[in-house]
Each structure stands twice: as structure tokens, then as C-alpha cells.
């Protein structure tokens, strides 16, 4: 759709005559009829296929025609067309004399024609005014013409419709060729797609207006490039939503079970060496002079009964000192001044001479010990029971009474109540001081997770458009992770599909 514009500029008819050569009375009151039609190889009479237009009387004999366009007048003359501009045309301009006020063709005598021109033209849309002049023996007509597109029509032949808009159906202005030019922040065929915040993750983020970055379920951060870990995840991270990948030293569904108690709590005291021996479990290896589960107890050096032959031990600042009974001497009262003749062996011990009678040794019966068999054997003196176990003498032997959670001859083995997998339905087992505790997955409860309480929230396939369903184990609900191009709690709404013809 467009307009052929014809600007009449000057008409010269100095003698004031008609085409027949007869003069006009009193002068030639001149008006024009214009016929625009399709290009003809030979211009020939026929219908004005592109339109016609007539002017009022513009002057007498010779005159210049005023440009009236600014005042809403009729010069340039407008010949609108509602088709693709073909680029070529035939143009016929007739100058007529109006003896009276009636300018209708049927009201004029046939010999009222002053002059007639007929040309074949070629004209591109939007070209500058093309000036032409047609001269005959009696008249001269100067005129110019051009073709422009109607509002909202563009292109080489005014065939492209484009209406600028800034609404739900598009955000654009029109280029001279009719192509869309998106407003800042918009893209796509119809400029309906907002350009999200720079760096906004292509899959995990989206936007409804420019420079925005809205995260899809399971993602967070300014650019939606950080996954949201499982609800309740304590010491863990994720690489996809709702994961809980435990940090080093942590375990369990929520990464809240301490697998590295030694590092996280440093329980061993007095420079002892700590060894992890299971979940929330450890063993301290004490430095000399210390004892207790956490090596928190300082040992008296006399506790190891270093003094022999009935010597009595006295603690000192820097160690201990043995007070020897008569007949003995040495750091530990280990040297005797007695011989077998003195019957030094008690409790039925038998005496043997040594070093040609200068010394002796007692061979003690069972349950007795010491240089002179003077001590009843106490098998608990060396604290053989680990992990706080209590040592009990039982005649010739001894036994360890272990604290709860420990077993073995010397209470050296940690008993895990969880070892027999007591938690049903994938429950996670936690060892406690006095027993165990089960953490149940969604859908199960009870002391051993034996009671079914709900079903998998994703079992009913609630997500549309091939979205991924995640069950939120802490709330028994589902979350849909939408593929690109869909939004909504169930990914049921498509994002920004272009309409077929928005106008």
C-alpha cells in the first residue's frame, strides 16, 4: 500500500488556446485530470487501473502551481494504491479548459481539451522527486512525481506491513526495509524474547523482562548457576539440585554424621594420638604417664609398683623414690644383701644360689610374684582394659568388664549398634552412647522406620513437558525442574512463543 504523488509545478499556454487551436474565452481556466495505470509497452487508451484524480481550476493560461501540501491542499496530487508497487507505470495528464464551474467530464465540450501527455515511467519507492517536462507547439507542462509507502508499509514495493509496537506481542520499531528492529533488551523473530541479565544461566535461569534473571526450581544465585542442595543438608554440597554430596569427614543423607571425630572435635588430651574408629567413634593412644578414654588422667609413677622386694614407693616432683626394706638396696630395691641361708623366699617360694652364694633368686609358686614371692599376683596393675573398662581379678586370671558400646578381651573393640542394619526402608542408623537412632526417609517412620506413612510425591508424574521431578524428602513434596521454554510449578506454561500474526 502506498501513494503515487504528482506535483504540478508550471503550465505554460501563452496564447491561451485549446488543442484545436481555438482560443479560450476570455482565457483558458485550466484544471487537470490525471490517469495512472499499469505499464504498457505502447501507451494505449483504457481504464486507469492505478487510479484517477482531478484538480480544481488552478490558473488561467500560464501559471505556476503552488505547493499546497503543508496547508492540507491538493498539490502534490495523491493517487493511493493498495497493491505491491510494480516499479513501472503509464501516466496520462490532461489539461482542460473550464468554461463554467462544472468540471465533470460529461459537462465539458470535447474540444475543451487544452493538451494531453502520456508517458511510460519507471520509479522506485522512496526515490527523490523525478522532474519531467512535456512540451508541444502550444503548451508546456512541468511536473514531478514520486512514490512513497503508506503508514506502516515498507520495502522496495510497499508490500511489507510493519507496525511498531511495545507490548506483549513484540517490542520493536520498523526499519526502512520493513524488517523489525528490536528495542533494547529484546530479541527473537518478533522481539518478544527478553534478553536476560548478562551471564544468566541458559538452562537454569529465565526472565520475563530485560536484564532480569529468575531461577528455575532447584537453582539460586544472581545468575542461577548455583544449585540448591537437599533441604537439611548440613556438611554437604550439590552439583545438581537437591543433591547432598558430603564434605570430607561427613556422612549420612544430610551429611550430618561425623566420620572424622578426631579432626572436628580433638577429643584426645595431653598430646595423645587420636584414631577414628567409626561414626562418632575414636581411640586415644596416651603418652606415657597418662590414662583414661581421652588420656585425661595423669598416672602416678608409683602406680606401676616400680619398687621391688617390698620397697615402698614415694612420688616426687621429678619421678619417684623407693624406700628399700632391710637387706635390699638399689634404685628399685633390686639388689639383695641376703643369701638363701636367710630363707628370703616367702609363700613357699624356693631359693636358688647365684654368683657363688653372693646372691639368690626366688622361684615363686603360682599367684605370687616379687623378688621374694612376697606379692600376690594382681593381673590388673598394668591397666590392660581399654576404653574405660574395669579390670577384675579372678584367681590366676583376670577379666575386663567393658563400658556399653565396647567389647573384646580388653574392651578394645567398639560395638556398633548399627552393625546389624536395624533401620528398615533405607533409614540411616546413628550410634548413641546408650543405643541407636534411625533417621527415616520420606514416607516412613517408627523407631526402626518400619511404618509406611506416605508415598513418593513424584510417583504420579506431576511434571509436564518432560520436566525432571525431584521428591523433597524433608517435606514429602515434589519439585519440577523445567526444560528450557517452560515455566510454572508443574512446567505447564510455555514461555514466549511468537503469535502467528500479532497484528
Amino acid at each position: 500500500s502506498g501513494v503515487f504523488q504528482l506535483q504540478l509545478q508550471e503550465f505554460i499556454n501563452e496564447r491561451g488556446v485549446l488543442a484545436s487551436g481555438r482560443p479560450c474565452e476570455p482565457g483558458c481556466r485550466t484544471f487537470f485530470r490525471v490517469c495512472l495505470k499499469h505499464f504498457q509497452a505502447v501507451v494505449s487508451p483504457g481504464p486507469c487501473t492505478f487510479g484517477t484524480v482531478s484538480t480544481p481550476v488552478l490558473g488561467t493560461n500560464s501559471f505556476a502551481v503552488r505547493d499546497d501540501s503543508s496547508g492540507g491542499g491538493r498539490n502534490p496530487l495523491q493517487l493511493p494504491f493498495n497493491f505491491t508497487w510494480p516499479g513501472t507505470f503509464s501516466l496520462i495528464i490532461e489539461a482542460w479548459h473550464a468554461p463554467g464551474d462544472d468540471l465533470r467530464p460529461e459537462a465539458l465540450p470535447p474540444d475543451a481539451l487544452i493538451s494531453k501527455i502520456a508517458i511510460q515511467g519507471s520509479l522506485a519507492v522512496g526515490q527523490n522527486w523525478l522532474l519531467d517536462e512535456q512540451t508541444s507547439t502550444l503548451t508546456r507542462l512541468r511536473y514531478s512525481y514520486r512514490v512513497i509507502c503508506s503508514d506502516n508499509y515498507y520495502g522496495d514495493n510497499c508490500s511489507r506491513l510493519c507496525k511498531k509496537r511495545n507490548d506483549h506481542f513484540g517490542h520493536y520499531v520498523c526499519q526502512p526495509d520493513g524488517n523489525l528492529s528490536c528495542l533494547p533488551g529484546w530479541t527473537g523473530e518478533y522481539c518478544q524474547q527478553p534478553i536476560c541479565l548478562s551471564g544468566c544461566h541458559e538452562q537454569n535461569g529465565y526472565c520475563s523482562k530485560p536484564a532480569e534473571c529468575l531461577c528455575r526450581p532447584g537453582w539460586q544465585g544472581r545468575l542461577c548457576n548455583e544449585c540448591i542442595p537437599h533441604n537439611g543438608c548440613r556438611h554437604g554440597t550439590c552439583s545438581t539440585p537437591w543433591q547432598c554430596t558430603c564434605d570430607e569427614g561427613w556422612g549420612g543423607l544430610f551429611c550430618d554424621q561425623d566420620l572424622n571425630y578426631c579432626t572436628h572435635h580433638s577429643p584426645c588430651k595431653n598430646g595423645a594420638t587420636c584414631s577414628n574408629s567409626g561414626q562418632r567413634s575414636y581411640t586415644c593412644t596416651c603418652r606415657p604417664g597418662y590414662t583414661g578414654v581421652d588420656c585425661e588422667l595423669e598416672l602416678s609413677e608409683c602406680d606401676s609398683n616400680p619398687c621391688r622386694n617390698g620397697g615402698s614407693c614415694k612420688d616426687q616432683e621429678d619421678g619417684y623414690h623407693c624406700l628399700c626394706p632391710p637387706g635390699y638396696y638399689g634404685l628399685h630395691c633390686e639388689h639383695s644383701t641376703l643369701s638363701c641361708a636367710d630363707s628370703p623366699c616367702f609363700n613357699g617360694g624356693s631359693c636358688r644360689e647365684r654368683n657363688q652364694g653372693a646372691n639368690y633368686a626366688c622361684e615363686c609358686p603360682p599367684n605370687f610374684t616379687g623378688s621374694n614371692c612376697e606379692k600376690k599376683v594382681d593381673r590388673c596393675t598394668s591397666n590392660p582394659c581399654a576404653n574405660g573398662g574395669q579390670c577384675l581379678n579372678r584367681g590366676p586370671s583376670r577379666m575386663c568388664r567393658c563400658r556399653p558400646g565396647f567389647t573384646g578381651t580388653y574392651c578394645e573393640l567398639h560395638v556398633s549398634d548399627c552393625a546389624r542394619n536395624p533401620c528398615a526402608h533405607g533409614g540411616t542408623c546413628h550410634d548413641l552412647e546408650n543405643g541407636l537412632m534411625c533417621t527415616c526417609p520420606a514416607g516412613f517412620s517408627g523407631r526402626r522406620c518400619e511404618v509406611r506413612t506416605s508415598i513418593d510425591a513424584c510417583a504420579s508424574s506431576p511434571c509436564f513437558n518432560r520436566a525432571t521431578c525431584y521428591t523433597d524428602l524433608s517435606t514429602d513434596t515434589f519439585v519440577c525442574n523445567c526444560p528450557y521454554g517452560f515455566v510454572g510449578s508443574r512446567c505447564e506454561f510455555p514461555v514466549g512463543l511468537p503469535p502467528s500474526f500479532p497484528w
Partner: antibody
Framework: EVQLVESGGGLVQPGGSLRLSCAAS????????MYWIRQAPGKGLEWVAF????????YYRDSVKGRFTISRDNSKSTLYLQMNSLRAEDTAVYHC???????????WGQGTMVTVSS | DIQMTQSPSSLSASVGDRVTITCRAS??????LAWYQQKPGKAPKLLIY???RLQDGVPSRFSGSGSGTDFTLTISSLQPEDFATYYC?????????FGQGTKLEIK
């Protein structure tokens, strides 16, 4: 009196060139589209080329496209036809004509003979 | 291209006869057709243009009719000077195309 007078014809070898002229008088030459039309000996009429009144539009028949060029000089009221790479089948009487049936105009020249032969 | 088929290609008639020549276009040319008369060694002379309009100075015994694709030239009463070759020409689209011609001879 309206006159169109062609000149420039003659005998030329195949592959040769000729330039035909058509001098107009007795009418306003610059107002009209002009045509070259030829007639081979004993044959019918055949249109060759067209140029619009201002020279902005030209058309040619397929068999002469790229070889013939039509032009005009309105200040001299003269029409031209530059013929290159001539062939035997171009042998004919060449007429220039001013045709505008809307205005009842139909002016023809008497023609100039072009013979292409070795 | 638009083909113009003219018939007959030749015709013998006597002075005073009514003669009809037809021309058929291969596509619609509206009324953009002319009829020419040519005598040996002369330039063609326009008789009828726009299918049915008589050119100034042409005797009224010549008339044209038709539109679209079928056209007719009629000579109502043949005169001795009318014996010549007649051509139709379509002026609707380039390339301009003529009919093959009809040679009108004295019987």
C-alpha cells in the same frame, strides 16, 4: 510535417558492428517513447528495442540482448541503435517508430537496410 | 512472451467484398491491440488502435472489434487500394509481438 529518417545501414560481415541513427522532426521528440522495428526480406514485422521518452527505461528482444544498445539524444531529436556482434539473421530493414496510441501517435521511418554477410 | 496468431495467412477477394481478418493472443491483452496495413517497400500504416479506435485519416470502411484475446479487423467494402498485407500488433507487454501477417490479394 512529421519525419523520421533512418541512416547508418549497409553491408557488414558477421561479428561486425553498425550504428543506426534516426533523425526526428515535425513533432516534440522528447515527449515520446521510441521503438526500433525490423523486417527481414520477405518476412513479417519484428520488434527489436524500446526507449522511454526520457531514456530511463529500455527493453530489448531476447535475441539481441547484450549485443544491441538503444539510446537517444533529446537535444538533437535523434534515436540510435548500436549493433555489435552482428549475425546473418540480423539482416533486415530497420525502421524507427514513435508509438503512443493514447495520443493517436504512430510515426514510422521508411527504414534502412542492414545486410550481414561474409 | 505473448504469441499473436493471425488468420488467414492469405486471402483472395474482390472489390466490394466484406473481408474479416482475426488475431488471437496467447493471454489477455485487454484492448491493447492495433492493426497495420503495409504495402511493398513502404513503412506500415496504422489503421486501428486500442482494438476499435479508427486512426485519423483512415477510411471508415475499416473497423476493429474484440478485447481480451480475440480480435477482428473488418473491411466492409473492399477497395482497389486495400490490397496489401495486414498485421496485428499487441502493445500490452514487452516484447511487442506482431501477427504473422495476412496477404490480401485480388481474386
Amino acid at each position: 510535417e512529421v519525419q523520421l529518417v533512418e541512416s547508418g545501414g549497409g553491408l557488414v560481415q558477421p561479428g561486425g558492428s553498425l550504428r543506426l541513427s534516426c533523425a526526428a522532426s515535425g513533432f516534440t521528440f522528447s515527449n515520446y517513447g521510441m521503438y526500433w522495428i525490423r523486417q527481414a526480406p520477405g518476412k513479417g514485422l519484428e520488434w527489436v528495442a524500446f526507449i522511454s521518452h526520457g531514456g530511463g527505461i529500455t527493453y530489448y528482444r531476447d535475441s539481441v540482448k547484450g549485443r544491441f544498445t538503444i539510446s537517444r539524444d533529446n537535444s538533437k531529436s535523434t534515436l540510435y541503435l548500436q549493433m555489435n556482434s552482428l549475425r546473418a539473421e540480423d539482416t533486415a530493414v530497420y525502421h524507427c517508430a514513435a508509438l503512443n496510441w493514447e495520443l493517436g501517435i504512430d510515426y514510422w521511418g521508411q527504414g534502412t537496410m542492414v545486410t550481414v554477410s561474409s | 512472451d505473448i504469441q499473436m496468431t493471425q488468420s488467414p495467412s492469405s486471402l483472395s477477394a474482390s472489390v466490394g467484398d466484406r473481408v474479416t481478418i482475426t488475431c488471437r493472443a496467447s493471454e489477455d491483452i485487454y484492448s491493447n491491440l492495433a492493426w497495420y496495413q503495409q504495402k511493398p517497400g513502404k513503412a506500415p500504416k496504422l489503421l486501428i488502435y486500442a482494438a476499435n479506435r479508427l486512426q485519423d485519416g483512415v477510411p471508415s470502411r475499416f473497423s476493429g472489434s474484440g478485447s481480451g484475446t480475440d480480435f477482428t479487423l473488418t473491411i466492409s467494402s473492399l477497395q482497389p487500394e486495400d490490397f496489401a498485407t495486414y498485421y496485428c500488433l499487441q502493445g500490452s507487454k514487452f516484447p511487442l509481438t506482431f501477427g504473422q501477417g495476412t496477404k490480401l490479394e485480388i481474386k
